[in-house]
């Protein structure tokens, strides 16, 4: 035992300080990651801190600037893209955000061989999406909802579609609901592997009801924003998929890909497109009632210049206990024979695992198994399959990368990351070069994030790409909260939780408790990741205990937990938060008179229902941009979990699960309701209806709106929001300011 003189101990204590709200709002303790922009098996590009575009060659250890910051600055470029033939770079500027993924920008093409910008036949502006072909330097782009093709950057464009119309017909880009709830991309066009064909989606929103809201701006009259937005049960977009030969685009024009008969018989969605070869494509379709998905493999018929999708190449995925897939239906990863593929779906025990499909789904060979889940397939090579899972040490909130040797029999499995930096790193993602010759690992925590480069054959670490040294040094004199991840076993349900404890936590004392909740279907809040954020500050400086709980409906712990909320949103998610709070009180260090709950989006819905549960557990709570009724939210998301709001389907639960129906129950809690008026996602309508119900019930509450702000409440609104919520909580918990 080494006794340290108290003098030394005190001086150490004195140099340490708690986190401040300013630290959080300024992003003082944010971290960096390093994702190589791979351009071959052993080369990658990276945008340096001073904005040069640098090529790194792993095998020579050399790097050189291919595009100077001077050239970047000449057009105010913030992003770039090298053509696969390495002759040209597109430079992106005038970024203008639209929705979650979409934005418009101005594009300039720089000719590396001649050291100058391409003049003549310049691109129009603003462009909605632009990309290079996978080989050579053809360009496809979307302008005013139509698709254009250039054989070379200096050539005149060939117009592929002509029917594009704002808010009516979208070609090559998704409409609002497909972008947010189905594709999760800003694009809806896909080049074939060698650039011979270009596939694209056409979305017809002509009959979709429009959400309209005011954008106040600075003018005398506000503008009205109109978005075709199908709410639950409303008319949906009509989707068609076309493919055009880019070598001879005028020859036969775009050819439509047929929809499988069992899908086309009623309302349906297109969910993803995966090219297999230049003449084979795989499309995934989904019934509007989202428990049946069809994967259709189509082949090019040279003689007819059409695409043929034989019934024998249709693979059906159906769920009898919930919806198809997890959050989305998984996508296939094809093997080298160009017909068989690997895919993640539920096994007979109800855990999502990798399966190998050679002929039929019924004959699928299960590749992984166990009471854990395979989460992502990163890469399949001739001899290895790389994937991530939460198998290691049975912590669902971890992610490790595994390699399965598929070239040998029986296949052997190796965890690539499990023992690399075990304390620091338990949550990984990966990025692979061509043929998986090299890969980057990005570790997100629980320690300070670190990005490393590895040999794809031996898994040997080659170098550290980013280790966040500055962050590590900055945190040396900060009293960070303690974090623990544990589980509660309640009525055959496992509730994993993360508890964030004040730095000087003492189990014999009583602390105020704040529950942070999201709780949406197929989400996960309890993850082994690093974060210094608002709740870190609340624990460090304000002495609160914060808890996050993954209840029923959350992901990666099997279908029993995931599908428990099917057709019953707003019930078990809330019950499980309440159950966890009762268990936390039993632990003895929670002041049961000072318990609060807060959440954003789906979390705002859950926190509102928890406050209105009538349990008397919560003193106060906050809902930021909450859903208040499932009839107000998007069809694709809502119906996946709730079915349709019709009498003969699930209208009754749609009505029973609203926040408004529980207005009376808010009488005995302090409620802070917050929403942006320009929220395109969870419309302000949701909070307007809560407020109206509370007023009609003569229930007092607090509210804050953010003018012209969307679902993210970004910029200066963020500072105002967190300052406002901090004051509210400190008042609720009787903490001095």
């Amino acid at each position: 035992i080494v006794l340290r003189p108290s003098r030394v101990h005190n001086s150490e204590e004195n140099t340490m300080r708690a986190l401040t709200l300013k630290d959080i709002l300024n992003g003082t303790f944010s971290y960096k990651t390093f994702f190589p922009n791979w351009i071959s098996g052993q080369e990658y590009l990276h945008q340096s801190a001073d904005n040069n575009i640098v090529l790194y060659n792993i095998e020579t250890g050399q790097s050189y600037t291919i595009l100077s910051n001077r050239t970047m600055k000449s057009v105010n470029a913030s992003n770039y893209g090298l053509s696969p033939d390495r002759q040209f770079v597109y430079l992106e500027s005038d970024y203008s955000k639209l929705w979650r993924y979409s934005y418009t920008a101005t594009y300039y093409i720089y000719d590396l061989s001649n050291g100058e910008f391409v003049r003549g036949n310049e691109l129009p502006r603003p462009i909605q999406y632009l990309c290079w072909s996978p080989v050579g330097s053809k360009l496809a782009y979307v302008y005013q909802n139509n698709i254009y093709l250039k054989q070379r950057p200096g050539d005149p464009p060939f117009q592929i579609t002509f029917n594009g119309r704002e808010n009516k017909i979208f070609n090559g880009i998704p409409d609002w609901v497909y972008e947010e709830e189905m594709l999760a991309t800003k694009y809806a066009l896909w080049w074939s592997p060698n650039g011979k064909f270009l596939a694209y989606a056409e979305f017809n929103d002509t009959d979709i009801p429009v959400i309209a809201y005011s954008y106040y701006g600075d003018e005398q009259y506000p503008r009205t924003i109109n978005i075709p937005y199908p709410k639950a049960g409303a008319k949906n977009p009509v989707v068609r998929i076309f493919i055009i030969d880019t070598t001879y685009p005028a020859y036969v024009g775009p050819q439509e890909v047929p929809v499988p008969a069992m899908i086309a018989s009623s309302d349906y969605y297109f969910s993803w497109l995966t090219w297999v070869t230049d003449e084979r494509v795989c499309l995934q379709w989904l019934k509007r009632v989202q428990n049946v998905s069809v994967l259709s493999i189509c082949d090019f018929r040279e003689d007819w210049q059409t695409w043929d999708c034989p019934k024998t190449q249709e693979h059906i995925e159906e769920s009898r206990t919930g919806w198809a897939g997890g959050f989305f239906v998984s996508t296939p990863v094809f093997s080298y024979d160009a017909i068989s593929y690997y895919k993640i779906f539920s096994d007979k025990d109800g855990y999502k695992h990798i399966h190998y499909i050679k002929d039929t789904v019924e004959n699928a060979i299960q590749i992984t198994s166990g009471k854990w889940e395979a989460i992502n397939i990163f890469r399949v090579t001739q001899d290895s399959l790389f994937y991530s899972s939460n198998e290691f040490e049975e912590y669902p909130g971890r992610r490790n990368i595994y390699r399965i040797s598929i070239g040998s029999y029986p296949p052997s499995k190796k965890c690539v990351t499990c023992h690399l930096r075990k304390e620091r790193c338990q949550y990984y993602t990966a990025s692979f070069s061509d043929y998986a010759k090299y890969y980057a690992l990005v570790c997100y925590g629980p320690g300070i994030p670190i990005s490393t480069l590895h040999d794809g054959r031996t898994d040997q670490e080659i170098k550290i790409l980013e280790e966040n040294k500055e962050l590590e040094n900055a945190l040396k004199n900060i009293q960070l909260p303690k974090e623990e991840i544990k589980k509660l076993e309640v009525d055959e349900i496992t509730l994993w939780y993360k508890m964030i404890l004040p730095p000087q936590f003492d189990r014999s004392k009583k602390y105020p408790l704040l529950i942070q909740v999201y709780g949406g279907p197929c989400s996960q809040s309890v993850r082994s990741v690093f974060a210094v954020n608002w709740i870190s500050y609340l624990a460090s400086k304000e002495g609160m205990v914060i808890a996050l709980v993954d209840g029923r409906g959350t992901a990666f712990q099997g279908d029993k937990l995931l599908y428990a909320v099917y057709r019953k949103l707003g019930v078990y998610e809330v019950e499980d938060q309440i159950t966890a709070v009762r268990k936390f009180i039993e632990m003895g260090f929670i002041d049961e008179k000072r318990i609060a709950i807060w959440g954003w989006s789906y979390g705002g819905y859950v926190s509102s229902l928890a406050l209105a549960s009538g349990t008397g557990l919560f003193k106060c709570g906050i809902a930021v941009a909450p859903v208040s009724s499932w009839e107000y939210y998007a069809s694709v998301y809502t119906e996946r979990f709730m079915g349709l709001p019709t009498k003969d389907d699930n209208l009754e639960h749609y009505k029973n699960s609203t926040v408004m129906a529980r207005a009376e129950y808010f009488r005995n809690v302090d409620y802070l309701l917050i929403h942006g008026t320009a929220d395109d996602n969870v419309h302000f309508q949701n909070s307007a209806q809560i407020a109206k119900a509370l007023v009609n019930a003569q229930v007092d509450f607090q509210a804050m709106w953010y003018s012209d702000q969307n679902h993210g409440l970004s910029g200066l609104s963020t500072n105002h929001l967190y300052t406002h919520m901090t004051h509210f909580l400190k008042q609720c918990f009787s903490l001095s300011d």
Epitope: S40, Q42, L55, E59, Y64, D434
Partner: nanobody, 115 residues
């Protein structure tokens, strides 16, 4: 700094063949991605063929299977075999890194295809 020196050009009849060579003075790793480019007077320089350190190749559409890029790591050499030459292949041919570095353009080697 590495210097790149092209050779092997000349006058050839349509349908004829040539083998262009590029030798690097100074150490040039076999892992460097290299390429052949060409330029017709009054026109922009363009890529003919590229090869990565891993041996992956890329050819311009106009090549149409007529040319082959290769390298000899022992000799620090990069080569371009030109077969089935056409009058429109007449140009100065250059080797450079792939993508090219502005300071590394050499004198080039002239290929003239004419009957």
């Amino acid at each position: 700094q590495v210097q790149l020196q092209e050779s092997g050009g000349g006058l050839v009849q349509p349908g004829g063949s040539l083998r262009l060579s590029c030798v690097a003075s100074g150490r040039l790793s076999s892992s460097n991605s290299m390429a052949w480019y060409r330029q017709v007077p009054g026109k922009r320089r363009e890529l003919v063929a590229g090869i990565t350190g891993g041996g992956e190749t890329n050819y311009a559409d106009f090549v149409g299977g007529r040319f082959t890029i290769s390298r000899d790591n022992a000799k620090n050499g990069l080569y371009l075999q030109l077969n089935g030459l056409k009058p429109e292949d007449t140009a100065a041919y250059y080797c450079n890194f792939w993508p090219p570095l502005i300071n590394y353009w050499g004198q080039g080697t002239q290929v003239t295809v004419s009957s």
